[in-house]
């Protein structure tokens, strides 16, 4: 009886769209790497669905993912990081869909942190600095950062600056005086690894000073 139910489940499952996407995070917890996968369709019924990765692993043939609500997750030291792995969605031991992926091409860096902005009165500029955990990593060390800033009242008018360092200077003359600005930063692998933008850092807010008239100037 249960056999018939399982076959029925399988037939139903084969009609669904099980497209999924994954990203890796290297050395995310000491020397441990992580791999996170999720279905593209948020309405997929994930009951009884499992994810498994096989190939390009150290000491083991395959690894099963843990399910955390609607995402599937592995944290391990066992990724070889050379060659392609096969990632499959399975139900009752049968693969529904699979993807061959090199984990070094789907890297999502950790979000930058400690973003701050310091105004230099003498230089009439703002020095933007932030930190990234990737400076200490063995693998994904080279990143491109995207610094985005906007005047708080301009909801969708973000200005973007791409840079490889963790320091940026914004000239006061290019910003509105006496205005509140929001600034944030994210990172993407830039060399040796490929992948996706990190999450945005927490936003930092700063106010530009009023324009001081020089002595002797008329109002």
């Amino acid at each position: 009886e249960s056999g018939y139910a399982q076959n029925g489940d399988l037939e139903d499952a084969e009609l669904d769209d099980y497209s999924f996407s994954c990203y890796s995070q290297l050395e995310v917890n000491g020397s441990q790497h992580s791999l996170t996968c999720a279905f593209e369709d948020p309405d997929v019924n994930t009951t009884n669905l499992e994810f498994e990765i096989c190939g390009a692993l150290v000491e083991v043939k395959c690894l099963s993912f843990r399910k955390l609500q609607e995402i599937y997750f592995i944290e391990t030291k066992k990724f070889l990081l050379i060659g392609k792995s096969n990632i499959c969605v399975k139900v009752g031991g049968k693969s529904l869909t699979c993807k061959k992926i090199d984990l070094t091409t789907i890297v999502k860096p950790e979000a930058p942190f400690d973003l701050s902005v310091i105004y230099r009165e003498g230089a009439n500029d703002f020095v933007v600095t932030f930190n990234t955990s990737h400076l200490q990593k063995k693998y994904v060390k080279v990143l491109m950062h995207d610094v985005a800033y906007r005047q708080e009242k301009d909801e969708n008018k973000w200005m973007h600056v791409n840079l490889s360092s963790t320091k940026l200077t914004l000239l006061q003359r290019n910003l509105q005086p006496e205005a509140m600005y929001e600034i944030k930063v994210r990172s993407i692998p830039d060399h040796y690894f490929k992948g996706f933008w990190s999450e945005w850092s927490p936003s930092y807010y700063f106010r530009t000073p009023e324009i001081n008239n020089s002595p002797g100037e008329m109002d």
Epitope: C54, G55, L81, I82, G83, D102, T104, Y139, Y192
Partner: nanobody, 118 residues
């Protein structure tokens, strides 16, 4: 039709060095993992070293770690194996392989002979 061609083998004295090259004509070279293997007379094929598509990640067998270095030049479609402090037991035919796909190397060269005399 030949897709992987090894070169650089030869006769060398113990303690000496050799640099093997493997040129690929496979269109996906710059996104493929590459590996080096050897087969000593009367022995099984032995994995030596592998390198990821960009060169950032390498992996070595314990038998060659610290003596051999794998590298690649994606502009030249070539992978190298620098072999230092060679020993008599390093004698064998050296093969390169391309595209490590779910634990199977998809393409293999014909090999180049390395002989280390003591």
């Amino acid at each position: 039709d030949v897709q992987l061609v090894e070169s650089g083998g030869g006769l060398v004295q113990a303690g000496g060095s050799l640099r093997l090259s493997c040129e690929s004509s496979i269109s996906t070279f710059s996104s493929d993992a590459m590996g080096w293997f050897r087969q000593a007379p009367g022995k099984e094929l032995e994995f030596l070293a592998a390198i990821g598509w960009s060169g950032a990640v390498t992996h070595y067998s314990d038998s060659v770690k610290g003596r051999f270095t794998i590298s690649r030049d994606n502009a030249k479609n070539t992978v190298y194996l620098q072999m230092n402090s060679l020993r008599a037991e390093d004698t064998g035919r050296y093969y390169c392989a391309e595209d490590y796909d779910t634990d199977v190397w998809q393409y293999w060269g014909q090999g180049t002979q390395v002989t280390v005399s003591s």
